[in-house]
Amino acid sequence: ATKLTEEKYELKEGQTLDVKCDYTLEKFASSQKAWQIIRDGEMPKTLACTERPSKNSHPVQVGRIILEDYHDHGLLRVRMVNLQVEDSGLYQCVIYQPPKEPHMLFDRIRLVVTKGFSGTPGSNENSTQNVYKIPPTTTKALCPLYTSPRTVTQAPPKSTADVSTPDSEINLTNVTDIIRVPVFN
């Protein structure tokens, strides 16, 4: 059985989660990648995905989530900006490879967002001040609806706060670094 571990990120409202998930260059460079949230006892829910085929470095934005796929370095960068307490929860990066089930890229991310604006939105607690000039635009990304039943065989630990956003609208904000650890079947 695969042991799924978590990396914990504690950030304040308004900060950005800026996560890097790396993958096997030759195998997955142009594959479609996705960012998912895992709620207790439920199948992972896709919040945003790259285009298909995935474009090199071209940002795809869905609400407050921004995905950038750097093909040459086998790197998916996930950012969730302007974090809210409700964004707290468990997340993961996956690669879509139909008809096979999605391939998880790394340790799941346990995001804990607390109240108390830090005054320095940006990635991690060490972030520099950022300037938002233009309201984020939203790119509608077409993501496959299937998820892997394997990922819910064992319920993840109870999250400190569930992310409760309507299915029709994603309200996630700045997400900082997500660490990926390969999961082997």
């Epitope: 890097k20 071209h58 750097y70 370095h73 060490n126 670094d177």
Partner: antibody, heavy 117, light 107 residues
């Protein structure tokens, strides 16, 4: 071939201003974060500022906040650094660099900025 | 900010020698470390990214290892063109920060 060419450096008095430019070619400029990195004479490298693909976010190192402004013109494949209230400690070679998610993968040749009276 | 400490600050070596440079982060940066080579009057050149991945076009005598806080750049057999200053860069937390550099000199 990816190319980054900086210009606009020179000698300026303390308190003065200077605008650096970086002309990019050989890649889809509008798809990448871009940065300015500087190197004082005989010293190490220091990241100064970066800007998102569409210009909607900017980040700065603490020592230049409120004095420097990074901007870009995607239509002209150009990156800029407006430097105001210059100080002697800003004297350095300024490099334009492409952010590639986990590193700066391409750099320009640099342009020297000297702040002296 | 995350502080990066390189050692040694300089090293004298001969052609054919094996050279090892280390970089230590003030906090865990997972694998998000890059290595650069810089020659006098030139821009830095990316050698290694993600701690151990070789940038396209870089000779295989260069290799990187490590994760968390401790990282190493190794030049397996020094060539004349390898005499330069080497920098590490952490790309985990903003702002990205560089090590102070290691100068590889001719013995």
């Amino acid at each position: 071939e990816v190319q980054l060419v900086e210009s606009g450096g020179g000698l300026v008095q303390p308190g003065g201003s200077l605008r650096l430019s970086c002309a990019a070619s050989g890649f889809t400029f509008s798809s990448y974060w871009m940065s300015w990195v500087r190197q004082a004479p005989g010293k190490g490298l220091e990241w100064v500022a970066n800007i998102k693909q569409d210009g909607s976010e900017e980040y700065y190192v603490d020592s230049v906040k409120g004095r420097f402004t990074i901007s870009r013109d995607n239509a002209k494949n150009s990156l800029f650094l407006q430097m105001n209230s210059l100080r002697a400690e800003d004297t350095a070679v300024y490099y334009c660099a492409r952010d590639y998610g986990d590193s700066f993968d391409y750099w320009g040749q640099g342009t020297l900025v000297t702040v002296s009276s | 900010d995350i502080q990066m400490t390189q050692s040694p600050s300089s090293v004298s070596a001969s052609v054919g020698d094996r050279v090892t440079i280390t970089c230590r982060a003030s906090q865990g940066i997972r694998k998000w470390l890059a290595w650069y080579q810089q020659k006098p009057g030139r821009a830095p050149k990316l050698l290694i990214y993600a701690a151990s991945r070789l940038q396209s076009g870089v000779p295989s005598r260069f290799s990187g290892s490590g994760s968390g806080t401790d990282f190493t750049l190794t030049i397996s057999s020094l060539r004349p063109e390898d005499f330069a200053t080497y920098y590490c860069l952490q790309a985990h937390g903003f702002p990205w920060t560089f090590g102070q550099g290691t100068k590889v000199e001719i013995k």
